[in-house]
């Protein structure tokens, strides 16, 4: 089958890194600099991606593969193949149209990207707040009061108050 296909279409013999050149009786010509073909049998080469401005070259373009970009420090990739670079914020902030803004009370962000998310509502799971939340960290939920059986309690209950001047019976 491969032999038949080759006889029918000489371009199928052209490997990655070349194109099937109609100007030269369909011989395989090398992709020109700043272009590539990642598959065989192509009739043109693809123009290499340019990593400019806020984009930084992670992998150079070769005759058989496109360049790959990432973002300069202070920015992070968004989209397939790092199609966009978005500004980093500090933990405890989110990016808005007006720049980085602190998370509102009751929300947190533990990353340099993304949005502020609400603290976990411990009471929805019947649990109590063990550690309070901050702008950078979610609350830590403790065991529910029902989980604390008298014998298993790790928290010592306070001693009953005694009235002054009275001795125990």
């Amino acid at each position: 089958f491969e032999r038949t296909r080759s006889l029918q279409d000489p371009c199928s013999n052209c490997p990655a890194g070349t194109f099937c050149d109609n100007n030269r009786n369909q011989i395989c010509s090398p992709c020109p600099p700043n272009s590539f073909s990642s598959a065989g049998g192509q009739r043109t080469c693809d123009i290499c991606r340019q990593c400019k401005g806020v984009f930084r070259t992670r992998k150079e373009c070769s005759s058989t593969s496109n360049a790959e970009c990432d973002c300069t420090p202070g920015f992070h990739c968004l989209g397939a193949g790092c199609s966009m670079c978005e500004q980093d914020c500090k933990q405890g902030q989110e990016l808005t149209k007006k720049g980085c803004k602190d998370c509102c009370f009751g929300t947190f962000n533990d990353q340099k990207r993304g949005i502020c998310r609400p603290w976990t509502n411990c009471s929805l799971d019947g649990k109590s707040v063990l550690v309070n939340g901050t702008k950078e960290r979610d609350v830590v939920c403790g065991p529910s009061p029902a989980d604390l059986s008298p014998g298993a309690s790790s928290v010592t209950p306070p001693a009953p108050a005694r009235e002054p001047g009275h001795s125990p019976q």
Epitope: D21, N23, C31, P32, P33, N34, T44, C45, D46, I47
Partner: nanobody
Framework: EVQLLESGGGLVQPGGSLRLSCAAS????????VGWVRQAPGKGLEWVSA????????YYAESVKGRFTISRDNAKNTLYLQMSSLRAEDTAVYYC???????????????RGQGTQVTVSS
């Protein structure tokens, strides 16, 4: 009509130098992506060097880096390839090439001239 006329080739001893010229007509060289390809005896085409209009950045094949220099004279509409420290493996027909950009986003190249023969031999 677009034409590319190469000249400057010849017989040179190893270690010697040559300067190839490519006179362009029918288009403005300074507005185009252009370069040099070569074909050694019994071999396929190989890109040697290119100069890209966007910023004038240059490309050189690893085998010629540090030995060949591409340049252009916009006033004369001419492309040059200065070749020094020539080696036997540089023996080839050298063609001036012009990038051809296609509507679908692809790119190929065009060599309209007859090329100029460079032979490096003692």
């Amino acid at each position: 009509e677009v034409q590319l006329l190469e000249s400057g080739g010849g017989l040179v001893q190893p270690g010697g130098s040559l300067r190839l010229s490519c006179a362009a007509s029918g288009f403005t060289l300074s507005h185009e992506d252009v370069g040099w390809v070569r074909q050694a005896p019994g071999k396929g085409l190989e890109w040697v060097s290119a100069i890209l209009d966007s910023g004038g950045s240059t490309y050189y094949a690893e085998s010629v880096k540090g030995r060949f220099t591409i340049s252009r004279d916009n006033a004369k509409n001419t492309l040059y390839l200065q070749m020094s420290s020539l080696r036997a493996e540089d023996t080839a027909v050298y063609y001036c090439a012009r990038y051809v950009y296609h509507a679908g986003g692809g790119v190929t190249f065009d060599t309209r001239g007859q090329g100029t023969q460079v032979t490096v031999s003692s």
